[in-house]
């Protein structure tokens, strides 16, 4: 007839896919089980091996992420239970849709990750790495976006995800985005023969430069960048009571806005 | 060698009530949980419920079919397992085993008894 | 509670050929079955614990296998002593529950 057991845990160790457990068994030699399970695997035997006299070990391998995993090692009927849960996995893609971007909105998308998710946590950082907003989003299958409103026109930004399962985090993976720039305000046109001295209002938020274009029937004929905090430029050499497409182009952030006038050169 | 001798089956009536016994010895028995099993004449072979050992604060667990009709204990000093049966039905006829489940070595064993049977008619 | 289907109820088959019984779980038992063979007038006697694992002094031509849902208990070549009823019994939750039998005999 086997002795009873009177066992001590080790160590226990996790991570997203194994887990390794291992145990002191005290006294004299005896039979023991460590059987293991999850809400939905049922309960099965864990393969043990001995480590030295009285340390025996048992690691499982290809598990499911995000899951609690029970480890029972049973003598008879004693038994000591350990609990442990495998790491979640963040998502395998993150991204943020350039086409749904506004001057003061982001939206951020993620495939589902692989394994037991709770939650998602999303946060949005600025350039100096500030965090500005963040959101504890509940995990879903048919839902696995976000927008952050009420940003910065022409700012860059960079956005987090991180899985959460139980009291348990994955590692973050991270994308960046950048909200457009405004367009500049209040175009006004000065107009002489030869030249147009263009002066505007700044938008809200960031800009790195500005950019003017005047083209005649879709062809560039003059050109010219300043500064961001400049407010006038002038095109000079043009042909008198001519009619060009003058683009005032707001840059920022890697990406660009713009406003479009038609203007008239005075006649000679 | 483990042994588990069952007794104090016969018959009863319907809405009666009898207690069964099992007898163990050959083992520990303090330290194992055991089972009752009932197989009715003729049929397959149904769990009725476990106890656990003292450590386990002797919890039980029943089949739905006889749950708050029929209650396992345990005395320990005895090395005796008992079934009080309550408020009995004719589909409660059966063979009653004793049954002792360890798990130990990797394993998880079963030891039977020979069995009691059970009669519930008018 | 996790409801245990044996198949075939019966199975006749000749000395030395090969009887395979299946059992399924209604519900992910993970490796916790066990199997069963019951003579007339005797308790059930253990074969396979842990699905696939023979118990002491039980004959290598009984093999048990399956995890989750799906298992199977094999008899290589069957004997005349094997004609008996065998049944599946899941331990991972509880109510335990045992499957309904499958009656094996020789054709």
């Known amino acids: 007839e086997p002795e009873r057991c009177n066992f001590t845990l080790a160590e226990s160790k996790a991570s997203s896919h194994s887990v390794s457990i291992q145990w002191r068994i005290l006294g004299s030699p005896c039979n023991f089980s460590l059987i293991y399970s999850s809400d939905t695997l049922g309960a099965a035997l864990c393969p043990t091996f001995r480590i030295d006299n009285t340390t025996y070990g048992c690691n499982l391998q290809d598990l499911q992420a995000g899951t609690i995993y029970n480890f029972r090692i049973i003598s008879l009927d004693e038994e000591r239970t350990v609990v442990l849960q495998t790491d979640p996995l963040p998502p395998a893609r993150f991204g943020v849709s350039k086409e749904k971007t506004t001057s003061t909105s982001l939206h951020v998308w993620w495939t589902p990750s692989s394994g037991k998710v709770t939650s998602y946590e999303v946060q949005l950082f600025d350039e100096n790495n500030q965090k500005i907003q963040g959101v504890q989003i509940q995990e879903s299958t048919s839902w696995n976006e976000y927008t952050f409103f009420n940003l910065t026109a022409g700012s860059k930004y960079n956005i987090a995800i991180t899985a959460v399962s139980g009291g348990k985090r994955s590692f973050s993976v991270y994308t960046n985005g950048s909200t457009v720039p405004s367009p500049v305000k209040d175009i006004g046109i000065s107009t002489k023969a030869n030249s147009l001295l263009i002066s505007w209002s700044h938008g809200s938020g960031n800009v790195e430069r500005y950019r003017l274009m005047l083209m005649d029937k879709g062809i560039l004929v003059h050109g010219g960048v300043v500064d961001k905090h400049a407010t006038s430029y002038a095109f000079h050499g043009l042909t008198p009571g001519y009619l060009y497409n003058l683009t005032v182009m707001t840059e920022a952030a890697g990406l660009q806005n713009y406003r479009w006038k038609l203007v008239r050169t005075a006649p000679m | 060698e483990v042994q588990l001798v069952e007794s104090g089956g016969g018959l009863v009536q319907p809405g009666g009530s009898l207690r069964l016994s099992c007898a163990a010895s050959g083992f520990t028995f303090n330290a194992n949980a055991m089972n009752w099993v009932r197989q009715a004449p003729g049929k397959g072979l149904e769990w009725v419920g476990r106890?656990?050992?003292?450590?386990?604060?002797?919890?039980?667990y029943y089949a739905g079919s006889v749950k708050d009709r029929f209650t396992i204990s345990r005395d320990d000093s005895k090395n005796s397992l008992y079934l009080q049966m309550n408020s009995l039905k004719t589909e409660d006829t059966a063979v009653y085993y004793c049954?002792?489940?360890?798990?130990?070595?990797?394993?998880?064993?079963?030891?039977w008894g020979q069995g009691t049977l059970v009669t519930v008619s008018s | 509670d996790i409801v245990m289907t044996q198949s075939p109820d019966s199975l006749a088959v000749s000395l030395g050929e090969r009887a395979t019984i299946n059992c399924k779980a209604s519900?992910?038992?993970?490796?916790?079955v066990a199997w069963y063979q019951q003579k007339p007038e005797q308790p059930p006697k253990l074969l396979i614990y842990w699905a696939s694992t023979r118990h002491t002094g039980v004959p290598d031509r009984f093999s048990g296998s399956g995890s989750g849902t799906d298992f199977t208990l094999t008899i290589s070549s069957l004997q005349a002593e094997d004609v008996a009823v065998y049944y599946c019994q899941q331990y991972s939750s509880y109510p335990f529950t045992f499957g309904g039998g499958t009656k094996v005999e020789i054709k």
């Open positions: 049954v002792r489940d360890y798990y130990g070595s990797s394993a998880w064993i079963t030891y």
């Open positions: 106890i656990r050992t003292k450590s386990n604060n002797y919890a039980t």
């Open positions: 519900q992910h038992v993970g490796t916790a």
